[in-house]
Structures are given as C-alpha cells and as structure tokens.
Interface confidence: low
C-alpha cells in the first residue's frame, strides 16, 4: 500500500484513479470501514466519520477518472489507512501525520536551550534531522535538543521527518535574543566625547524591558551603576543616571550612550544588561573604554593609557618626520629631554593604530 506523510495543520490529497477516464461511483472509507465521502449520482456525499467537515474531493477531476480525497487541517489522529473503492477494486493509502513544535517560546535568549518535540502517530518510528540557519545539523528521535543557542542560530530551522523512505519538511522560525556583539572596545584621547552603541541582533514588533550599565573603572575598587533605563515599544527612557559621569542616552534603538568626555578615571569595563518583558534571563554586552593622555612636564614627555588593554598592544612615542621612537608593551612610555617638534603617541596592535594623540614640544631657551 502507498504511504503518504502529512503535516499537522496542513492539507493533504490522497489520490485514487479509475482505469476508465470517466465519472463513476467511488467511496473513501477509513480502516473501520466507516464511509468518509463518495459519489451518489452527480453529488458528493459525506458519511458519519469524524473527517466529514474536513474532507473534500476535486469534482473537476472526476470526469478524468481521478477521485482524490482532500483532508484539511490535519490532526495526528487522522493517521490511518484509508480505502478508496472504485470499479470493484480497493486502493489502500496509509496516511501518517506528524507535528513538530518548539517546547517553549521561539524567541529565546542566547545561551538558553531549545527543544523541538515531534508528535507522531502510534506505531510509527520516525527519525528527525534539523538544520540550523548557520548550517548546524542535529539529529534525533521524538525530541531534538540544542543546549546553548548562539546568535547564528537565529532564523529558519529546517527539519526533515523521515518514515518508510518518505519525508516531510517542517520550517520553524527561531529568534535568538542577543546583542550583535558580545564585546566591544572604544579607544579615545582624554577629553574626547565617547559614543557607546549596543545594536540588537534581532527585531521584535514590540520591545519592552529595562536595562542597566554597570561600570568597573580601572582605578575604582568596586563597580557602580552608571545608568538605568526602561524600554517601552522601542522607546528608551532614562530612569536613573550617576552625577559623575553624567551619561546621555538616545531615545530610540539601537541603545546609544554618550559620555561627554573620556577621562582616565572613567577608563575600564562596563556590562550592559537588558531584561526583556516576559523573558527569563538577561541580554549582556561588555564594553571597554581605553583612554590616552600625552603630557609634558618639565623635561619629561609622557604618554599613558588607562583601561583594559591586551599585553600584546604597543605604546610608542614618535617624533614626527624623525626616527626618534620609544616603544613598549606597557601602559606608559616617556622620553626625557625630548627634542622640539610634534610628537605622536600611538597605541597599536600588530601594526594597526588603535589610538593616536599629538603633543607639541616647544624648544626651551
């Protein structure tokens, strides 16, 4: 007998063909011999089965000897062997209906787990293979688990259910709630305005929640809350902000913070958290601020950086258009009795300049 796989909620068409290409008597019955539908004269008649309000046939194809049965809004319990009786012969079709659903909300925080559950008819032994938008393949039986969702898991998951060499494909849209970046570093000269941006890696029609930026300054012994805010339908409103520094916050997404000026005492690391309404857990993004200062005091020219720098970074003092250079993998460099001219302080990573500050040394007469 023929096997047909269907998806819960979908429509399926079971075909039945007569040898004569003409309109003739036919009946569809279930395995209990209860009539579902058939033809009486020129009219479609329906029997007392549970399918009567969801079963139909393509009348336009009857003249061609095609007597299909269409079942709408499929249910798992529609799985059965259906018998088509036409021209004194019986055709059997086994229909197996499957459903695949996410156990929880399909909007999940990064790091949370996703479980997909397969609903299947008794006696079936299907296998499931799912492919994430990022190309990750996961196999399973009745359940498929993804223990820790990542940003790249956002999008349409394609799951193939296989049974008796037949397959049916499900598409499930998963949204991973996360910031676009896990971490970012801003490099600024002392006194410059600092812009922090926290773009989200998803879009939701209604986005409501609350957030906070905690800051651990390099010079401070403990962290402190710099700002707390609310998010209502993508509109941002500040709840509380420290007096020093007095941050400003944009009213629209993406979340945007402005520090009026970069100062050594602000250099350090921050953690922006965002708690979304009706979600357990929080979104996190780390942000780092590195501040540079170049100064001349008496006979000493000094360049310093504050904030989280990697040991690989190089700090250099260089006299413009001259070979004079001092470089160190350290947070401060200095030159005693510097030559007159324009000096550059450079913070670089493998030759790539991250931050630059110029200071003019005037000749001492």
């Amino acid at each position: 007998k023929k096997v047909v796989l269907g998806k819960k909620g979908d429509t399926v068409e079971l075909t039945c063909n007569a040898s004569q290409k003409k309109n003739t008597q036919f009946h569809w019955k279930n395995s209990n011999q209860i009539k579902i539908l058939g033809i009486q004269g020129l009219f479609l008649t329906k029997g007392p089965s549970k399918l009567s309000d969801r079963a139909d046939s393509r009348k336009s194809l009857w003249d061609q000897g095609c007597f299909s049965m269409i079942i709408k809004n499929l249910k798992i319990e529609d799985s059965d062997t259906y018998i088509c009786e036409v021209e004194n012969k019986k055709e059997e079709v086994e229909l197996l209906v499957f459903g695949l659903t996410a156990n929880s909300d399909t909007h999940l925080l990064e790091g949370q787990s996703l479980t997909l559950t397969l609903e299947s008819p008794p006696g079936s032994s299907p296998s499931v293979k799912c492919r994430s938008p990022g190309g990750k393949n996961i196999q399973g039986g009745r359940t498929i688990s993804v223990p820790q969702l990542e940003r790249q898991d956002s999008g349409t998951w394609t799951c193939t259910v296989s049974q008796d060499q037949k397959t049916v494909e499900f598409k499930i849209d998963i949204v991973v709630l996360a910031f676009q970046k896990a971490s970012s570093t801003v490099y600024k000269k002392e006194g410059e305005q600092v812009e922090f941006s926290f773009p989200l890696a998803f879009t939701l029609e209604k986005l409501t929640g609350s957030g906070e930026l905690w800051w651990q300054a390099e010079r401070a012994s403990s962290s402190k809350s710099w700002i707390t805010f609310d998010l209502k339908n993508k509109e941002v409103s500040v709840k509380r902000v420290t007096q020093d520094p007095k941050l400003q916050m944009g009213k629209k997404l993406p979340l945007h913070l402005t520090l009026p000026q970069a100062l050594p005492q602000y250099a350090g690391s921050g953690n922006l958290t965002l708690a979304l309404e009706a979600k357990t857990g929080k979104l996190h993004q780390e942000v780092n601020l590195v501040v540079m200062r170049a100064t001349q005091f008496q006979e000493n020219l000094t360049c310093e950086v504050w904030g989280p720098t990697s040991p690989k970074l190089t700090l250099s003092l260089k006299l413009e258009n001259k070979g004079a250079t001092v470089s160190k993998q350290a947070k401060a460099v200095w030159v005693l009795n510097p030559e007159a001219g324009m000096w550059q302080c450079l913070l670089s990573d493998s030759g790539q300049v991250l931050l630059e500050s110029n200071i003019k040394v005037v000749p001492t007469w």
Epitope: R151, S350, Q352
Partner: antibody, heavy 120, light 107 residues
Framework: EVQLVESGGGLVQPGGSLRLSCAAS????????MSWVRQAPGKGLEWVAN????????YYVDSVKGRFTISRDNAKNSLYLQMNSLRAEDTAVYYC?????????????WGQGTTVTVSS | AIQMTQSPSSLSASVGDRVTITCRAS??????LGWYQQKPGKAPKLLIY???SLQSGVPSRFSGRGSGTDFALTISSLQPEDFATYYC?????????FGQGTRLEIK
C-alpha cells in the same frame, strides 16, 4: 595597512589539486571569520567557503563540498583553500575576503585575487 | 538555498543621474544584505552592509534600503568613477549568495 594577499594559483589538469594561500596583515586575523569567493571568466561572483575565527566551523557551497577544504593557521595569519578533483568549471579568479564581525556585515576587506585555470 | 534576483542586469546612465538597483530574496532575510562595487580586473569593494549602513570611506551618494525580501542600492548623482558592476550579497545563512550583478555603463 589592512591587507590580504592570495597566492598559489596556476594551471592544473582536470582531476588535479592545488592549494591556495592568503596572507593577512594589519588586523587581528584570529578575530575574524574568513571567506573564499571566486569569479569565473566573464561571470559574476560566487561565494565558495568560509571558516570561523578558531577554525571550528566551516561552510561550503554545494558544488565544492567534498572536494575543497578551507583551513587557517592563526599563528601564521594565513588562510588556505585545498582544492582536489578539480574540474574545468572551477576555473576562476579566487579571492580571499574578511567576513564582517557578524551576520549582515558583509566582506569588508578583499585580496587582489589569484587565477586558477583547470584545463587539459 | 535562498535565491537572490538582481535587476536590471545592465543599465546605461549619464553623469549626474540618479540610479537604483534592486535585489529580491526568495524568502525573508532580515537586513543581512550587502552591496559591492567591482571594476574590471579589480577585487570587489564593500559599499553598504546590513542593507542600509554605509561602509567607512564610501561616498554618501551611495545609499541602501530595504529589509525582509526587497532591497535597493541608490546612487544619488552618478560620478565618472561609479561606472562599474554592482552585486548584492546575502550573508544571512549558508550558502552565502550573490546577485547576478548589474553592469552600469555610460550612456
């Protein structure tokens, strides 16, 4: 200066092998996904493969799966494409490119390309 | 795989003209689309990322818009150096897919 330089292209017979290299400089190579993109003579661009920062994930276009292998050596700031069982339709200029930091951020740095000709 | 349909395949325009090139995805891709310019014998150059963000160093006459399935690149006032081939690129999931390209020629 941020730079990518490809090498290793040349003339090879159908069924032969070739290994392309891409030397990166001027940026933290180990912090970026990297891609190979090719362009057949007179044709458009085709993405071939890419590799995660630490090499733990690799993706390929269907037409090269099982024949091409993308790899990287972060200590040498180098990206590679091992091409086996080469076919005439693999004839193209091959570019290495730096992937943006996350989805939707494009390929922001490209090499000048290296030419691969597969012909008997 | 998601298909990208880019149009037109070629376009003739004059210096100072405003031109628009479009790309349509066979299914929704959020805003994960970039636009590239390529001149003969040269490597492609990223102009627009994330559908509408201008890449650093790219002139402001280039702009991108769209999300979901329909995207467009507009050059507000063509300059002589803008005559080239333009490609859209979907990097939402694998395989990454380029549009067929649009050749922009001097009328």
């Amino acid at each position: 200066e941020v730079q990518l330089v490809e090498s290793g292209g040349g003339l090879v017979q159908p069924g032969g092998s070739l290994r392309l290299s891409c030397a990166a400089s001027g940026f933290t190579f180990s912090s970026y996904w990297m891609s190979w993109v090719r362009q057949a003579p007179g044709k458009g661009l085709e993405w071939v493969a890419n590799i995660k920062e630490d090499g733990s994930e690799k993706y390929y276009v269907d037409s090269v799966k099982g024949r091409f292998t993308i790899s990287r050596d972060n200590a040498k700031n180098s990206l590679y494409l091992q091409m086996n069982s080469l076919r005439a339709e693999d004839t193209a200029v091959y570019y290495c490119a730096r992937d943006g930091s996350y989805s939707g951020y494009g390929m922001d740095v490209w090499g000048q390309g290296t030419t691969v000709t597969v012909s008997s | 795989a998601i298909q990208m349909t880019q149009s037109p395949s070629s376009l003739s325009a004059s210096v100072g003209d405003r031109v628009t090139i479009t790309c349509r995805a066979s299914q929704g891709i959020r805003n994960d689309l970039g636009w590239y310019q390529q001149k003969p014998g040269k490597a492609p150059k990223l102009l627009i990322y994330a559908a509408s963000s201008l890449q650093s160093g790219v002139p402001s006459r280039f702009s991108g818009r769209g999300s979901g399935t329909d995207f467009a690149l507009t050059i507000s006032s063509l300059q002589p150096e803008d005559f080239a081939t333009y490609y859209c690129l979907l990097d939402y999931n694998y395989p990454y897919t380029f549009g067929q390209g649009t050749r922009l020629e001097i009328k």
